[in-house]
C-alpha cells in the first residue's frame, strides 16, 4: 500500500480467483484513543472499533472511503483504491490502446517546435467518475523539471455504439534550449482513477522524436502565363522554432482531387514555393517536416485549384 | 558565445554541401545498423545516449544562433578554446565566434573519426563479419574535415591488445551512430544558418 495523495491510498493486488488479497491497517488521524468506530462509504454498519482497523482487501467491495467517527463526529477519512496486477501485468482498463505508432500505446505526445512545450493526449470510453493527474520530468534518476497543467476533456467522438473521450494535457520543460541535443528522455506519468480503480500510464520520448510542425500558412497561387502550371507559395507556421535558417523545414506539395484514389501531382522542396499542375476540382496541399530530423509531417494546408 | 549574422556570402559557404552529405551518410549507416543488428538493442529507445564529445567540445553552445543567445537555458558555462583558421571561413568579417564554432565541429569530427576507425578495425576481426562501417561515411567525415581545414594535433587511433567483445562493440556502434546522427543534425543546422546569414 502507498499514499497517492493526502488520505488517498493505493492497494496493489495480485488479481486472480481466490487470491488472498492484502492486509491493510488503517489508523484514525486523531489524538482520541477511545470510542472510535469505523464505517465504509455511505453505510452505517460499524466495521470495527478502536484507533486502528485491520481489513483484508481482496476485491473492489473492500475498497472505498473508510471513515472513523466518535460520537457522531467524523474524525478522519482514508480512501482506498485498488491497482490490479493480472499475470504480472498492471491493468490498463481505463485508457484505450491507440495502437499508434505501436501496440500498447496509451499516451501520445506531440510538440509543434523545439521550445520544450508539448501536448499529450489519451482516449477512454469512460464518461464519469474519472480523474487524471499528470507529472513529467526530464530523465528519471536525476529528474529535471517539467511543468504540466491539468488534464482536460478535449474532444468527444462517436465510434460505432460507443462514445470516445479524448483528454489532453500541456507540459513545458522548465529550462529548455531549442538547440540542445537531448540525451535524457522526457518521462510523462499519468495517474488515472475510475471510481475505486487506480492505474498508471507512462511514456518516454525525446522532443525531437515527437515534433510535428503546424501546417504551412498563407498558401497563395499564381497562375503561370501560357501554361497549365501554377506557382504555389507559402510561409513557415508561426509556431515553428526560429531562426528558420537554423530550424529549417522541408515541404511536400500535392495536387489531388477529392478522392485519395485520384491521380495527383507531387513534388518535394526545401523552398517556400513550387510549381505544380493544377486540375479543375482539385486542391493544392502543402505540408511540412523538419528538414534534418525526420519526425512527423504536419497536417496539410490546402487551397482549391480554381 | 554565438554565431554572428555577418558571415559568408549566400550560397558561397563550402561546408554546407559536405554537411548534408554527412547527415545522409550517418543516417544511412544507422538505418543499416538497425536492420543488420535487429536482435541487438540498437533502437533509440533501447540504447544509452552517450556523447563522446561531452566536456571536450561545446558545439551546441559555440554554434548557437544569435537569436538564441537571449535564451538563458542555451547559455552553458562550459568554455573551450580552439584553433582559429579554416577554409570554410570564406569572409574576412567572420568573427572569432564563428571560428570557435567551426573548430568545435572539426574536433567533433576528429573524435568520431578515431572512434569509428577503431571500431571498424574490431568489426573486421569478427568471424561473423556481420557489419562494417560504410566507407562512404568515413570518406564524408574526411571531406568535411578537409573543407573545414583546421590544423590540430593528430589523435592516435586507439589500439587494444585484449580480444574484442564483438557483442559489446556492436552495441557501442549503435550508441555511437545515434549520437553522431544527432551531432550531424546540429552541424547541418549550423551550416544552413551560416549559409543563409
Amino acid at each position: 500500500i502507498w499514499e497517492l495523495k493526502k488520505d488517498v491510498y493505493v492497494v496493489e493486488l495480485d488479481w486472480y480467483p481466490d487470491a488472498p488479497g492484502e492486509m491493510v491497517v488503517l489508523t484514525c488521524d486523531t489524538p482520541e484513543e477511545d470510542g472510535i468506530t469505523w464505517t465504509l462509504d455511505q453505510s452505517s454498519e460499524v466495521l470495527g472499533s478502536g484507533k486502528t482497523l485491520t481489513i483484508q482487501v481482496k476485491e473492489f467491495g473492500d475498497a472505498g472511503q473508510y471513515t472513523c467517527h466518535k460520537g457522531g463526529e467524523v474524525l478522519s477519512h482514508s480512501l482506498l483504491l485498488l491497482h490490479k496486477k493480472e499475470d504480472g501485468i498492471w491493468s490498463t482498463d481505463i485508457l484505450k490502446d491507440q495502437k499508434e505508432p505501436k501496440n500498447k500505446t496509451f499516451l501520445r505526445c506531440e510538440a509543434k517546435n523545439y521550445s520544450g512545450r508539448f501536448t499529450c493526449w489519451w482516449l477512454t470510453t469512460i464518461s464519469t467518475d474519472l480523474t487524471f493527474s499528470v507529472k513529467s520530468s526530464r530523465g528519471s534518476s536525476d529528474p529535471q523539471g517539467v511543468t504540466c497543467g491539468a488534464a482536460t476533456l478535449s474532444a468527444e467522438r462517436v465510434r460505432g455504439d460507443n462514445k470516445e473521450y479524448e483528454y489532453s494535457v500541456e507540459c513545458q520543460e522548465d529550462s529548455a534550449c531549442p538547440a540542445a541535443e537531448e540525451s535524457l528522455p522526457i518521462e510523462v506519468m499519468v495517474d488515472a482513477v475510475h471510481k475505486l480503480k487506480y492505474e498508471n500510464y507512462t511514456s518516454s520520448f525525446f522532443i525531437r522524436d515527437i515534433i510535428k510542425p503546424d501546417p504551412p500558412k498563407n498558401l497563395q497561387l499564381k497562375p503561370l502565363k501560357n501554361s497549365r502550371q501554377v506557382e504555389v507559395s507559402w510561409e513557415y507556421p508561426d509556431t515553428w522554432s526560429t531562426p528558420h535558417s537554423y530550424f529549417s523545414l522541408t515541404f511536400c506539395v500535392q495536387v489531388q482531387g477529392k478522392s485519395k484514389r485520384e491521380k495527383k501531382d507531387r513534388v518535394f522542396t526545401d523552398k517556400t514555393s513550387a510549381t505544380v499542375i493544377c486540375r479543375k476540382n482539385a486542391s493544392i496541399s502543402v505540408r511540412a517536416q523538419d528538414r534534418y530530423y525526420s519526425s512527423s509531417w504536419s497536417e496539410w494546408a490546402s487551397v482549391p485549384c480554381s | 558565445r554565438n554565431l554572428p549574422v555577418a558571415t559568408p556570402d549566400p550560397g558561397m559557404f563550402p561546408c554546407l554541401h559536405h554537411s548534408q552529405n554527412l547527415l545522409r551518410a550517418v543516417s544511412n549507416m544507422l538505418q543499416k545498423a538497425r536492420q543488420t543488428l535487429e536482435f541487438y538493442p540498437c533502437t533509440s529507445e533501447e540504447i544509452d545516449h552517450e556523447d563522446i564529445t561531452k566536456d571536450k567540445t561545446s558545439t551546441v553552445e559555440a554554434c548557437l544562433p544569435l537569436e538564441l543567445t537571449k535564451n538563458e537555458s542555451c547559455l552553458n558555462s562550459r568554455e573551450t578554446s580552439f584553433i582559429t583558421n579554416g577554409s570554410c571561413l570564406a569572409s574576412r568579417k567572420t568573427s572569432f565566434m564563428m571560428a570557435l564554432c567551426l573548430s568545435s565541429i572539426y574536433e567533433d569530427l576528429k573524435m568520431y573519426q578515431v572512434e569509428f576507425k577503431t571500431m571498424n578495425a574490431k568489426l573486421l576481426m569478427d568471424p561473423k563479419r556481420q557489419i562494417f562501417l560504410d566507407q562512404n561515411m568515413l570518406a564524408v567525415i574526411d571531406e568535411l574535415m578537409q573543407a573545414l581545414n583546421f590544423n590540430s594535433e593528430t589523435v592516435p587511433q586507439k589500439s587494444s591488445l585484449e580480444e574484442p567483445d564483438f557483442y559489446k562493440t556492436k552495441i557501442k556502434l549503435c550508441i555511437l551512430l545515434h549520437a553522431f546522427r544527432i551531432r550531424a543534425v546540429t552541424i547541418d543546422r549550423v551550416m544552413s544558418y551560416l549559409n543563409a546569414s
Epitope: 522541408t250 484514389r261 491521380k263 | -
Partner: antibody, heavy 118, light 107 residues
Framework: QVQLVQSGAEVKKPGASVKVSCKAS????????LHWVRQAPGQGLEWMGW????????EYAPKFQGRVTMTTDTSTSTAYMELRSLRSDDTAVYYC???????????WGQGTMVTVSS | EIVMTQSPATLSVSPGERATLSCRAS??????LHWYQQKPGQAPRLLIY???QSISGIPARFSGSGSGTEFTLTISSLQSEDFAVYYC?????????FGGGTKVEIK
C-alpha cells in the same frame, strides 16, 4: 492488371509524320496520366510530354513543342502521339508510360520502333 | 532544364557483390528523384521513387538514398538478373529529364 499495348514498328521518310498508339487496359483510363518517352538506339531515355486523358490537358518538352501532338480517345482507352517533320535523329523506340502520379512512370508499354530513313 | 549525370557509365561487379550507382543533379532537386532498371529489348521498370521509397514487388536488395544534388542506388548483393542499365530521373521541374544511365555488367 494494368497494361499498355503499343502499335507496331514504323518506317518513315524524313519530313513525314508518324502516329503511334497506346491502348490501356486493367484500369480506368482517365485515372492515370499518360506520358511519351523515347530512346534512340544505344542511347538513354528522353521525356517528350504528358497528357491527362480526363480533360486532354498536355505539357510538352520544349524540344518537341510545335512538332508533337498527344491525344486520347477515352471510348477506346487509347492514347496517340503524333510526331511531325521527322528527321533521321528521330529514329528511336517510342514508349508510352502511365502513372497516377504525374512526374514518374509506373507502367510502361512495350515500345514502338520508329525508323526514319530516306 | 535540369541535367542529370550518372556515374560510372559502366560498373563491373561480381554476382553477390554490392553495387553503388551515383546520380547527380545540376541543381538541388530535394528528393524528386526516381530510379529505373532496363534490360536489353525491354521497357524500363520503376525500382525506387522519391529517392528512397521502395516499390512492392521489387526485391529488398534495391535501396535508394540521397537528397539535394547527390543520389545513390545500392544493390546490396547482385543477382544474375540485376545485370542491366539503370537510369535516374528527376521530377523537380518540367521538362522531366533522365540521367545517361549506368550499365551494370558481370565482372
Amino acid at each position: 492488371q494494368v497494361q499498355l499495348v503499343q502499335s507496331g514498328a514504323e518506317v518513315k521518310k524524313p519530313g513525314a509524320s508518324v502516329k503511334v498508339s497506346c491502348k490501356a487496359s486493367g484500369y480506368a483510363f482517365t485515372d492515370y496520366y499518360l506520358h511519351w518517352v523515347r530512346q534512340a538506339p544505344g542511347q538513354g531515355l528522353e521525356w517528350m510530354g504528358w497528357i491527362d486523358p480526363e480533360n486532354g490537358d498536355t505539357e510538352y518538352a520544349p524540344k518537341f513543342q510545335g512538332r508533337v501532338t498527344m491525344t486520347t480517345d477515352t471510348s477506346t482507352s487509347t492514347a496517340y502521339m503524333e510526331l511531325r517533320s521527322l528527321r533521321s535523329d528521330d529514329t528511336a523506340v517510342y514508349y508510352c508510360a502511365a502513372n497516377k502520379e504525374l512526374r514518374y512512370f509506373d507502367v510502361w508499354g512495350q515500345g514502338t520502333m520508329v525508323t526514319v530513313s530516306s | 532544364e535540369i541535367v542529370m549525370t550518372q556515374s560510372p557509365a559502366t560498373l563491373s561487379v561480381s554476382p553477390g557483390e554490392r553495387a553503388t550507382l551515383s546520380c547527380r543533379a545540376s541543381q538541388s532537386i530535394s528528393i524528386n528523384l526516381h530510379w529505373y532498371q532496363q534490360k536489353p529489348g525491354q521497357a524500363p521498370r520503376l525500382l525506387i521513387y522519391f529517392a528512397s521509397q521502395s516499390i512492392s514487388g521489387i526485391p529488398a536488395r534495391f535501396s535508394g538514398s540521397g537528397s539535394g544534388t547527390e543520389f545513390t542506388l545500392t544493390i546490396s548483393s547482385l543477382q544474375s538478373e540485376d545485370f542491366a542499365v539503370y537510369y535516374c530521373q528527376q521530377s523537380n521541374s518540367f521538362p522531366l529529364t533522365f540521367g545517361g544511365g549506368t550499365k551494370v555488367e558481370i565482372k
